[in-house]
Every structure is written in C-alpha cells, then in structure tokens.
C-alpha cells in the first residue's frame, strides 16, 4: 500500500491521544535505553510503511503484535486516514485469524514495540533530519 | 460496500447496562474502526466514539465502552448506568475519514422502569 | 467540542424548488464536513464528504460548497424523494460532531 495519500495529521491526533500510551502499557517494566534503536525512517510515508510493517507482519520471535490493542488502533486510524488501505488488508486480516494463538510477551517483541516507538516518534517529526 | 448487521432491540431498567453487537461483512476492514452514534426520538444524530476517538462526547465519559473482535468483524457498544434519556436507536457506521457512508439497520434502546 | 450550527431547522418547499441548507461551525474545520439524507425510521445516507465531494450513487442535484467555518448543502431541483432531514458533520475535531438537522418539509 502507498501511504502518500494519507492524513498524517489526522494519524497523529490518532497516535498521541491513544495508540502512543498502548504502546507505553505495553512497555511498562522496561528501560526506556533497555533497546537501541535499528530501524528508521525518511519521510511520512516511509514511517508508515515501516509502522505497518513491524506491527502486523510476523518476526522471528515475536509472532503476535498484530492482536495489541496499540496493533488495533494502529490498523484502525489507517483504515480511517489512508484512503483505500481497507481494501488491501483481505490477506494479511485472513492470515491474523488462522494465526490466533496464545500471547506470549516475549525480549524479542518488546525490543520490536521499542522499535515502533521511535518510528512513530520519527512520524510526528517529519521535518527533522535523518540522523 | 460494507454490510453492518447490528443486535435486535432491547429494554432495560435505569441503572443497567446495554451491549450492542454490530457484525461486519461484505468488505475488508478493521472492525476497531468502527464509530457509533445514536438518536434519541425526534432527535438528531449524536456522536457517541470509535475505539481511537478517545476523547468519547463528554456526555458519554465514563458510560460507554467500544470494544471488536477481530476474529469475527464484531464491534461492540456497551452503555452502563443507562437513564430514561438513553432511549434512543443506535447505530453503528464505517466510512473512511469518518465519511459514514456504511450503517447498521440500529438497535433501538428502551430504558423504562 | 466543536459545535455545529444549522440552518434553516426546518424548511417547507415544493418540488423543482432550489433549497440551501447552510451549516456554521465553531472553529475552523478547514474542508472536513460530510453532508447526511435521513427519512424516518431509516438510517443516515451520506450525500456528500470533504465539503464538495458527491458520493457514489448521489444524484448531481445535490452539491456542497465551503471551507474553514461556513457550509453549504444546495439541491438544484427538489424532487419528490428529496423530503428528508439533513445533517452536516464535522470531522476535523475529536469527537466528530453533527449539526442538529433541517428538515425539508412539502410546502
């Protein structure tokens, strides 16, 4: 999906208000420098790209983001912001039902959701430089 | 389009509690994105939230609770300590932007003692 | 909240007639306001979105037009199917909000 079109503003108000402290009760107990931070991104679009892919596609060690309530909002405010994102979601939504297995927090996804957190924090900083 | 087929109506006392179901099909989409509004007798429309428009109606905080699940594109509307003044229709929608352009058939609410 | 204002509450007109609804909202919204078709006992139809963007399967008569505060819902040439109360939304604050209604009466 190409993000281009998308309100980032609207997706902002979104992050700020609700998916951000998701993410922050997910991560409680951990140190905020207990992770470095590997993956970024370069502009608005690329950030989502990036935001989409690390929560709702599986990794190595950390199989089940996508059933985070900070996941669901996530998918929420890009199918209310982005326009047409609903539409390409059929496979990835038919493959999370087939998948429906026990939560288990493991290092592996909290390092992931540590990830997501400056990603989003590099999407409500569009104008600064990469560093 | 999406199709929304909302629960069948229901009377409750003051004081109670109300869950309405909304089961979407016909398309592919977050059920967490879901919004819910009602419409109390010769009333207008009325905003009630979606799971990320946190900031519920003031009238609202507190009293209602939105929640889905995935697993079968049910979104749910749960409305506690329910009053004379919460007999209305609701309804639940989806449109992108908030655009509603997909409704449910509503539930109507009867709150009577 | 941002308050949504509409106006005329209540109008009566005969059919070919051109009718306006204008909606006022409190604070700036830019173009983020949706345009509603209700008849009784059924649920919303959105007629219009963005302020001047006509949904799919609306006829042409119906047109938006506005931005930042003042709105306007124009039919060009009431028909018969058309006597129905409208609502205007806002969608750039949170919550959304809703206008309170005009209601297009037979004159």
């Known amino acids: 999906y190409d993000f281009t079109n998308c309100d980032f503003e609207k997706i902002k108000a979104a992050y700020l208000s609700t998916i951000s402290k998701d993410l922050i009760t997910y991560m409680s107990g951990t140190k905020s420098t207990e992770f470095n931070n590997t993956v970024s991104c370069s502009n608005r679009p690329h950030c989502l790209t990036e935001i989409q892919s690390l929560t709702f596609n599986p990794t190595a060690g950390c199989a089940s983001l996508a059933k985070e309530m900070f996941a669901m909002k996530t998918k929420a405010a890009l199918a209310i912001w982005c326009p047409g994102y609903s539409e390409t979601q059929i496979n990835a939504t038919q493959a999370m039902k087939k998948r429906r297995k026990r939560k288990v927090t493991t290092n592996k996804c909290l390092e992931q959701v540590s990830q997501l957190q400056g990603l989003w924090r590099r999407f409500n900083r569009p104008l600064l430089k990469q560093q | 389009q999406v199709q929304l087929v909302q629960s069948g109506a229901e009377v409750k006392k003051p004081g109670s509690s109300v869950k309405v179901s909304c089961k979407a099909s016909?398309?592919?989409?977050?059920?967490?994105?879901i919004s819910w509004v009602r419409q109390a007798p010769g009333q207008g429309l009325e905003w009630m939230g979606g799971?990320?428009?946190?900031n519920y109606a003031q009238k609202f905080q507190g009293r209602v609770t939105i929640t889905a699940d995935e697993s079968t594109s049910t979104a749910y509307m749960e409305l506690s300590s329910l009053r004379s003044e919460d007999t209305a229709v609701y309804y639940c929608?989806?449109?992108?932007?908030?655009?509603?352009?997909?409704w449910g058939q509503g539930t109507l609410v009867t709150v009577s003692s | 909240d941002i308050q949504m204002t509409q106006s005329p509450s209540s109008l009566s007109a005969s059919v070919g007639d051109r009718v306006t609804i204008t909606c006022r909202a409190s604070?700036?919204?830019?173009?983020?306001l949706n345009w509603y078709q209700q008849k009784p006992g059924k649920a919303p139809k959105l007629l219009i979105y963005?302020?001047?963007s006509l949904q799919s399967g609306v006829p042409s008569r119906f047109s938006g037009s506005g931005s930042g505060t003042d709105f306007t819902l124009t039919i060009s040439s009431l028909q018969p199917e058309d006597f129905a109360t409208y609502y205007c939304?806002?969608?750039?604050?949170?919550?959304?909000?809703f206008g309170q209604g005009t209601k297009v009466e037979i004159k």
């Open positions: 929608a989806w449109g992108a932007k908030y655009a509603l352009d997909s």
């Open positions: 016909g398309g592919t989409f977050s059920t967490y994105a």
């Open positions: 799971i990320i428009s946190i």
């Open positions: 604070q700036t919204i830019g173009t983020y």
């Open positions: 963005s302020a001047s």
């Open positions: 939304q806002q969608t750039d604050g949170n919550p959304p909000t």
